[in-house]
């Protein structure tokens, strides 16, 4: 019969900092130079040995002769409580078939961390713990004084706890969350009625989780240095100096080197010359509670992203072509660049590829005269893509050109004694075809009936009129305009020696808030287009003149600007345009585009006063200079008599009160004979004109008192 | 009973050095941060320094640092303030003070300080 | 330079209320809990309130703290005449790296 191999010399140390216990122990009787697998059953004790809190097996191989070691973390900090520790072991080897036993348990070991000895009558454990966010955590006091009435906070809250026994009492803190980098606060006070007997407070430090970090990569832009980045995510650093920010170390399991990175999100590795082509790096993330690794595999000539290009320049510049020149650095022999040019200018952006070995070369054409252009260029590896460099640019500016279309010119004519003036009106030209700073406009005046006559005006820019006073001949007028390289197609109108402003009616017409719309007869005859132009009814014809061109076979279109105000009148003519460029006036048209109430009442005279009647007339009243058409007028009539008199109807005012009103339909009948009306009596009146948006501003009734019929006679 | 004694104050010159004590009993020393508090004559409050129970983390005042260190000899219960490069204005009442805990709660003990006068 | 402001006096006659704030930043009361300190003339300052609203046994309920954002106050209800002393909030300020005393206000019972 084999003797029981008892566990012996057993021996418990402790590591308050970990909350552990650390085992160790011989097994006596072991035969020499023999091998056996062994199970040891391990018990532990809180407080006293019959209060077993923990059981547990540990299977191992023995050798004769062994220290066994064995650990065992508390949850519960080791200074809380003494615990106590005993082992006891079986064989569990096939070498040995028959029934095993286990042997005798071990004398319980106490483990006292005494912690608790200075002078203070409380003490809270742990003092300054590291744990990661989500962790469960028991904390624990000891008071002296089992007198003292013990109460205990985190972050200003009181916490209620498990009594171990009278003197101790732990808390069970679960899934602590992160509160400030400084720690989360938790502290007890003892006290005795109102009188405290001290306070202790310990910070329990909580780390946000380590993060894997984000976005490994590594590239190369001279095959001299690897450059690797990565988001690290968030900062796990800890206040009072209690944890650092996590530290980044990268490893190359090729070459087998390592460097510690010195920024938390990048890194530059040495390439060596030693031909490796390909990298497996891994990037291990560790603070002091946990490492995090993420692995990247890649071919070095995969990963090059190449310094910006350099030296970009423009060579023969002319008004519509560019060459565009540029350099890269040559990171190897036979490399070859992809290239990427953009074309920004004039509101467009054009892209453009090319391939090169050494020096970059690119010929831009069709671009816009006196034109600035911004050009960038950015390259790549043509082989292995992998990114683009960043970009490089500059910008150049093609030269003028000569314009390269007509103004576009309109006139107005008005005939006065022996002559015509005639006001010459053009629009600047667009940049598309002004092709450089127009400089001046020469306008050329020929008497198409003196054909060896003919005159030359040149008006600086920015101009764009000019007053001509000319005689009864027909004449033929040039427009141009230049800039420093040449001079535009010419503009040409015709003005007749007929007069042309024979008598067309005036038509009225609504506009709507898009504008107007017109239409008109077409003229007999060839026409090369129509021109229709306005002005505002009540100003200077100079001061807001505007005309579009219609094409020939259009005989309608809206006339739509922002310029169109409420309550203004404009004043519309439409010419026809003959194959002589000479304008026949073919309809005249005049409205709102929206039409406001009047603005004003007329002043009204009393005249004629009898009686039994009385004239008011109101012959000064000027109906051109309204907001709107006036269609007429509204004339209301106050007086004591109940009925109203002929003509007039009975009307309610704004005020509530009732009165009667006549309305006069006739814009231009400005004048009414009010009779039917008592002798001395007293009348009141108010004259008021109307638009298709409504009567004019309400203002004080006139009074009026008649006569007795002696006097009035 | 509670008890922090400050020592080491007096007159000194500009430029010249001074080293304050502070002897604590009445508690377990080694379980509480501890603070140099200075209070110049007729003003406020003016935290100098403090240091940690295990003296892991220590924090200076701007107008301190570089010139004054703070120690601590948890099996002397003695808290220390070495001063150098003395100013004018580094003239007050310097009063030690015990923490509430293991780093910087506040100041719930303190002692009834020692004067240190920097003058020419 | 005090990193923490509070008015240079406050007065009430005996039974007020009076009310001493204390204004700061996000780098302190913003992120720190505040402590409230008194000092008669003379003597050490005393600890008041800590962790922004807790008061120490043998400290009346008539003082009481409270936080919020980056200021603080600090309430004595029923004042009395031994309440007349110099009162001090005070944080921590991470940005300096430094515990910071306010500027102090001298209670004064009428």
């Known amino acids: 019969e084999r003797l029981p191999l008892t566990p012996v010399s057993l021996k418990v140390s402790t590591n308050s900092t970990r909350q552990s216990l650390h085992l160790q122990w011989t097994v006596h009787n072991l035969p020499y130079h023999q091998e056996l697998k062994m199970v040891f059953q391990i018990q532990i004790s809180r407080i006293e040995t019959s209060n077993v809190i923990w059981v547990g097996n540990y299977s191992t191989t023995v050798k004769w002769n062994q220290v066994l070691h064995w650990s065992w973390e508390s949850e519960l900090p080791l200074e809380c409580a003494t615990h106590f520790v005993r082992i006891k072991s079986l064989v569990d080897d096939a070498k040995f078939p028959e029934p095993n036993f286990w042997s005798n348990w071990s004398s319980w070991e106490e483990v006292s961390v005494q912690d608790s000895t200075g002078q203070d009558i409380l003490f809270v454990f742990p003092k300054d713990k590291l744990v990661e966010e989500g962790t469960n955590v028991t904390i624990c006091y000891v008071s002296r004084n089992i007198q003292n009435n013990v109460s205990c906070y985190l972050e200003g809250k009181q916490i209620h706890g498990e009594q171990l026994d009278p003197h101790v009492t732990a808390f069970n803190l679960n899934s602590v969350p992160f509160i400030r980098n400084k720690g989360t606060n938790i502290y007890c006070e003892a006290s005795q009625g109102n009188v405290s007997e001290g306070m202790k407070g310990i910070v329990l430090f909580v780390s946000k989780v380590l993060e894997e970090p984000k976005d490994f990569s590594c590239e190369t832009e001279d095959f001299k240095t690897l450059h690797c980045t990565w988001d690290p995510g968030t900062d796990t650093a800890l206040g009072w100096s209690k944890q650092p920010s996590q530290s980044y170390t990268l490893f190359e399991s090729f070459s087998g080197e390592k460097k510690l990175c010195t920024h938390k999100n990048w890194c530059n590795w040495q390439i060596t010359q030693d031909s490796q082509e390909t990298y497996n790096f891994t990037l291990i993330a560790e603070n002091y509670l946990r490492k995090r690794s993420v692995n990247i595999l890649f071919n070095l000539t995969h990963r090059v992203y190449l310094m910006n290009p350099f030296s970009v320049n423009f060579e023969n510049v002319n008004a519509t072509n560019a060459i565009m020149t540029w350099k890269v650095h040559s990171i190897r022999n036979n490399f070859t660049y992809l290239c990427q040019i953009e074309l920004h200018g004039e509101g467009k952006m054009m892209q453009y590829n090319v391939s090169i070995k050494v020096n970059g070369e690119y010929f831009l054409s069709e671009l816009e005269p006196a034109t600035e252009y911004m050009a960038r260029v950015r390259c790549a590896d043509a082989s292995h893509f992998w990114k683009w460099s960043e970009w490089s640019g500059q910008n150049f500016t093609t030269l003028e050109a000569a314009p390269s279309e007509a103004p576009d010119v309109w006139r107005i004519v008005s005939l006065e004694p022996g002559n015509h003036t005639v006001t010459l009106f053009w629009k600047p030209l667009s940049k598309l075809h002004a092709n450089g700073k127009i400089l001046f406009y020469n306008v050329v005046v020929e008497n198409l009936d003196k054909p060896s006559s003919s005159e030359l005006h040149s008006i600086p820019a920015p101009a764009n009129s000019t007053k001509l006073i000319l005689d009864r001949c027909s004449y033929q007028i040039c427009v141009i305009a230049n800039n420093s390289v040449g001079a535009s197609p010419a503009s040409v109108i015709v003005i007749s020696a007929d007069p042309e402003n024979k008598e067309v009616e005036e038509e009225r017409i609504a506009g709507t808030e898009g504008g107007f719309s017109l239409s008109w007869k077409p003229q007999p005859g060839d026409v090369i287009g129509y021109v229709v132009d306005w002005c505002d009814h009540t100003q200077d014809v100079l001061g807001d003149f505007q005309w579009k061109n219609v094409g020939p076979n259009t005989t309608s279109t809206v006339i739509s600007t922002d310029a169109f105000r409420p309550g203004v009148r404009y004043d519309f003519r439409i010419y026809g345009l003959s194959t002589k460029r000479i304008a026949c006036l073919l309809e005249k048209k005049t409205g709102y585009s929206q039409e406001l109430a009047p603005s004003d009442n007329p002043h009204v005279l009393v005249d004629t006063l009898t009686s039994h009647s009385f004239t008011l007339s109101w012959k000064d009243y000027s109906t051109e200079s309204q907001p709107g058409f006036i269609q007429g007028y509204h004339v209301y009539l106050k007086s004591k008599a109940r009925q109203c008199h002929p003509r007039f109807e009975k009307a309610v005012l704004s005020d509530g009160s009732e009165c009667c009103k006549y309305k006069i339909d006739n814009p231009e009948e400005k004048a009414l004979i009010v009779d039917n009306l008592k002798p001395e009596s007293f009348y009141e009146f108010f004259i008021t004109p109307f638009t298709s948006a409504g009567e004019g501003p309400s203002a004080t009734f006139t009074k009026v008192t008649t006569p007795d019929e002696h006097s009035s006679m | 009973q509670v008890e922090l004694v400050e020592s080491g104050g007096g007159l000194v010159q500009p430029g010249r050095s001074l080293r304050l004590s502070c002897a604590a009993s009445?508690?377990?020393?080694?379980?509480?941060?501890m603070h140099w508090v200075r209070q110049a004559p007729g003003k406020g409050l003016e935290w100098v320094s403090g240091i940690s129970w295990n003296s892991g983390s220590i924090g200076y005042a701007d107008s301190v640092k570089g010139r004054f260190t703070i120690s601590r000899d948890n099996a002397k219960n003695s808290l220390y303030l070495q001063m150098n490069s003395l100013r004018a204005e580094d003239t007050a009442l310097y009063y030690c003070a015990k923490d509430i805990g293991v780093y910087y709660y506040g100041m719930d003990v303190w002692g009834q300080g020692t004067t240190v006068s920097v003058s020419s | 330079q005090s990193a923490l402001t509070q008015p240079p006096s406050a007065s009430g006659t005996p039974g007020q209320k009076v009310t001493i704030s204390c204004s700061g930043s996000?780098?302190?009361?913003?992120?720190?809990?505040v402590n409230w300190y008194q000092q008669f003339p003379g003597p050490a300052p005393k600890l008041l309130i800590h962790s922004n609203n807790q008061r120490p046994s043998g400290v009346p309920d008539r003082f009481s703290g409270s936080k919020s954002g980056t200021s603080a106050s600090l309430a004595i209800s029923g004042l009395q005449s031994d309440d007349e002393a110099d009162y001090y909030c005070?944080?921590?300020?991470?940005?300096?790296?430094?515990?910071?005393f306010g500027t102090g206000t001298k209670v004064t019972v009428l």
């Open positions: 005070a944080a921590w300020d991470d940005s300096l790296n430094a515990y910071v």
């Open positions: 996000s780098s302190n009361i913003g992120s720190s809990p």
């Open positions: 009445g508690f377990t020393f080694d379980d509480y941060a």
